[in-house]
Structure formats: structure tokens, C-alpha cells
């Protein structure tokens, strides 16, 4: 009796089960009662990453430098090329089809996580006792200066954007 379902890594065609082509190979001809499935390796610029019955291999992704992209990992016959962004840029999506500049954290905010080729800068508000007076993609919130350790007193309180101002102690005390 002809099969109605096939084993793993097989497919049903013309009432018989044929072997799928292994990753890195494309289908040339289906199996018959006399021959196995005929498969051919993908060319150098192509890939197939699953057991398949595709008659064409997929083209490797092109990392377009005009879009700020560069090759992170070269593709093989079984894997696609992985693109990443050039220094100072990060991907706009998970598939990394284009890049945008990293954002800077504004004064009052510090860098919680520095950007990578695939993720943007993560900023956080400077908590009490910390400040940032610059717009930066790298600098964290810095602690206010400790006037006491310098035998000085606070003359002007700090904010999330400014450091404290220290001054000499009042001698009339």
C-alpha cells in the first residue's frame, strides 16, 4: 500500500516517501522506486539551513556598507550571513537590515547600558546623590562631590544635572 505519511526528514510525493535534502543542499530531482532523492550543494554565495525540498538555495544576506552594515559572521552553505552595524551605530530591527546612530543620554541622565551593534544606548535618570552634566553615549551618572572628605561644606546643593559646590567652613562657629 502507498504510504500516507512519511518519517522525519522525508516527504511524500507520487505516493512514495522521498528523503529531504540535507542543509546546504538543494533538490535536483525527487526520488523514484529506483533512485534516491538527488540533491546538489548550494553555491558559495547561497545557503539552505534546514532539511528541505527546495529547488533553489537562498542568497546570502548582503551587509550594505551604505546602510552602515558590516559582516559579523560570514555565511556558509548551511547558514546565512550575519550583519552588524559599524562603530557608533546599531540595528533598527532584529533582522538588522539598516543602522542608526546610538542615542546619547541627556544631562540629568546617565548610561545604564552602552550600545552595541545590535542594541541602542539605555539611559537612566540620575538618582539623588548623582548627576550628569553632559550629553553622552558612554558616561554614567557621577556621584556628587563629597565636601566633608575635603574638610569643606556644601555651598550649593547638587541636582541631577549639576554637582554640589563646596566651600570653606564658616569660621565664626
Amino acid at each position: 500500500e502507498p504510504p500516507t505519511a512519511c518519517r522525519e526528514k522525508q516527504y511524500l510525493i507520487n505516493s512514495q516517501c522521498c528523503s529531504l535534502c540535507q542543509p546546504g543542499q538543494k533538490l535536483v530531482s525527487d526520488c523514484t522506486e529506483f533512485t534516491e532523492t538527488e540533491c546538489l550543494p548550494c553555491s558559495e554565495s547561497e545557503f539552505l539551513d534546514t532539511w528541505n525540498r527546495e529547488t533553489r538555495c537562498h542568497q546570502h544576506k548582503y551587509c550594505d556598507p551604505n546602510l552602515g552594515l558590516q559582516v559579523q559572521q560570514k555565511g556558509t552553505s548551511e547558514t546565512d550571513t550575519i550583519c552588524t552595524c559599524e562603530e557608533g551605530l546599531h540595528c533598527t530591527s532584529e533582522s538588522c537590515e539598516s543602522c542608526v546612530p546610538h542615542r546619547s543620554c541627556l544631562p540629568g541622565f546617565g548610561v545604564k547600558q552602552i550600545a552595541t551593534g545590535v542594541s541602542d544606548t539605555i539611559c537612566e535618570p540620575c538618582p539623588v546623590g548623582f548627576f550628569s552634566n553632559v550629553s553622552s553615549a558612554f558616561e554614567k551618572c557621577r556621584p556628587w562631590t563629597s565636601c566633608e572628605t575635603k574638610d569643606l561644606v556644601v555651598q550649593q546643593a547638587g541636582t541631577n544635572k549639576t554637582d554640589v559646590v563646596c566651600g570653606p567652613q564658616d569660621r565664626q562657629r
Epitope: N14, V28, S29, C31, T32, E33, F34, T35, E36, E38
Partner: antibody
Framework: EVKLVESGGGLVKPGASLKLSCAAS????????ISWVRQTSDKRLEWVAS????????YYPDNVKGRFTISRENAKNTLYLQMSSLKSEDTALYYC??????????WGQGTSVTVSS | DIVLTQSPVTLSVTPGDSVSLSCRAS??????LHWYQQKSHESPRLLIK???QSISGIPSRFSGSGSGTDFTLSINSVETEDFGIYFC?????????FGAGTKLELK
């Protein structure tokens, strides 16, 4: 018991035609593809033709394509090979063989074809 | 067409010897290869399928190995009934092709 019995061989002149038969028994004939394979005097084996279980697909090597025709009558459990425009190089012992899991798992005893003037 | 080259052409052995017969394909055929034995005045019979799978009724002294382009048929302790010609056959693509055979004869 699986049995394949070839017949129809003989001595013919170049350019002549000949029809070989293969009678099958001991298995469900209509479930199996069948091939013809020939063996020359130097003992080399050469695939000649194949036909699918239903008879809808046939396969030939280039050197016999257009001259040989494989066919089958499932109701009669019989396989045929119609050979025309025979050449001296077609001289051989012709076997029919059953295709089981893509292997020629059972062979007949062969029938001899001689093409000579 | 895929060409199968068998070696040696002839192998002269004494019963009890263990032997290896080679079959080399002109291009990769994965494990899509069968082995047949043909004794004198008999039809070929299937010995090993898919390069290494045993066949019911065939003595366990026969074994096959290999994948890609290089294949081996091994006979562990040859018996007198093993003399004859051994053929490999590929079923990776059309046309189906056979090797020219290795003749196993008595030394």
C-alpha cells in the same frame, strides 16, 4: 517464493526487433517497480530500463532511448521489453529484476539475445 | 554519469582469509550504493543495501561500509561458496550504473 522468469530471447539480425517478457510470481507485482539489466560476455552489468509499479513512469539510459520500450501488464503479472533497431552491441544476457527499497532484490535467470548478421 | 571503479579486478584467496573489496564513485553518492554477488552460472543476488545494511538470508560474514565516494565490502573468513564476481551499483542518480566487478577466485 519470489520468482521472475524471462523469455523471448534469440538470434536476430542487426536492425531487427525482439520482444522480451518477464513473468512474475510469489509477490504483489503491481506494488513493485521492475528493471531490465543486461550482462555482456565480459560479465559487465548494464542497466537497460526501469518501469514504476503503476507503469506510468519509465526510465532509460541514452544508449537505448528511442529504441527500447519497457511496459507492463499488472493484471497478467508480466513485464515486457520491446527492442527495435537492434545493434551488435545489444548482444547480452537480459535479466529482469524487482526493485525493493531501491535495490534489485530479486533477479530472473536471464534470457539470451544475440544480434549478428 | 556516475562511474564506479572497483578494485582489485581479481582477488585470489584461500578459504579462511578475510578480504576487502573496494568501490569508488566518481562523485559523492552519500550511502546510495548496493553490493551484489554473482556465482558462476547464476544470476546476481543482493548482498548489502544502502552501503552497509544487511540482507535477510545473507551470512553475517558479509559487511559493507563507506559513504560519499569510497565504499568497502568485507568478507570475514571466506568460504568456498563465496567465490564469484562482486558488483557495486549506485542509485543516487540516473542512469543507474554498476562497477565492472571484482572476481574473487581460489588461490
Amino acid at each position: 517464493e519470489v520468482k521472475l522468469v524471462e523469455s523471448g530471447g534469440g538470434l536476430v539480425k542487426p536492425g531487427a526487433s525482439l520482444k522480451l517478457s518477464c513473468a512474475a510470481s510469489g509477490f504483489t507485482f503491481s506494488n513493485y517497480g521492475i528493471s531490465w539489466v543486461r550482462q555482456t560476455s565480459d560479465k559487465r552489468l548494464e542497466w537497460v530500463a526501469s518501469i514504476s509499479s503503476g507503469g506510468d513512469n519509465t526510465y532509460y539510459p541514452d544508449n537505448v532511448k528511442g529504441r527500447f520500450t519497457i511496459s507492463r501488464e499488472n493484471a497478467k503479472n508480466t513485464l515486457y521489453l520491446q527492442m527495435s533497431s537492434l545493434k551488435s552491441e545489444d548482444t547480452a544476457l537480459y535479466y529482469c529484476a524487482r526493485a525493493g527499497e531501491k535495490a534489485m532484490d530479486y533477479w530472473g535467470q536471464g534470457t539470451s539475445v544475440t544480434v549478428s548478421s | 554519469d556516475i562511474v564506479l571503479t572497483q578494485s582489485p579486478v581479481t582477488l585470489s584467496v584461500t578459504p579462511g582469509d578475510s578480504v576487502s573489496l573496494s568501490c569508488r564513485a566518481s562523485q559523492t553518492i552519500n550511502n546510495n550504493l548496493h553490493w551484489y554477488q554473482q556465482k558462476s552460472h547464476e544470476s546476481p543476488r543482493l548482498l548489502i543495501k544502502y552501503a552497509s545494511q544487511s540482507i535477510s538470508g545473507i551470512p553475517s560474514r558479509f559487511s559493507g561500509s563507506g559513504s560519499g565516494t569510497d565504499f568497502t565490502l568485507s568478507i570475514n573468513s571466506v568460504e568456498t561458496e563465496d567465490f564469484g564476481i562482486y558488483f557495486c551499483q549506485q542509485f543516487s542518480s540516473w542512469p543507474l550504473t554498476f562497477g565492472a566487478g571484482t572476481k574473487l577466485e581460489l588461490k
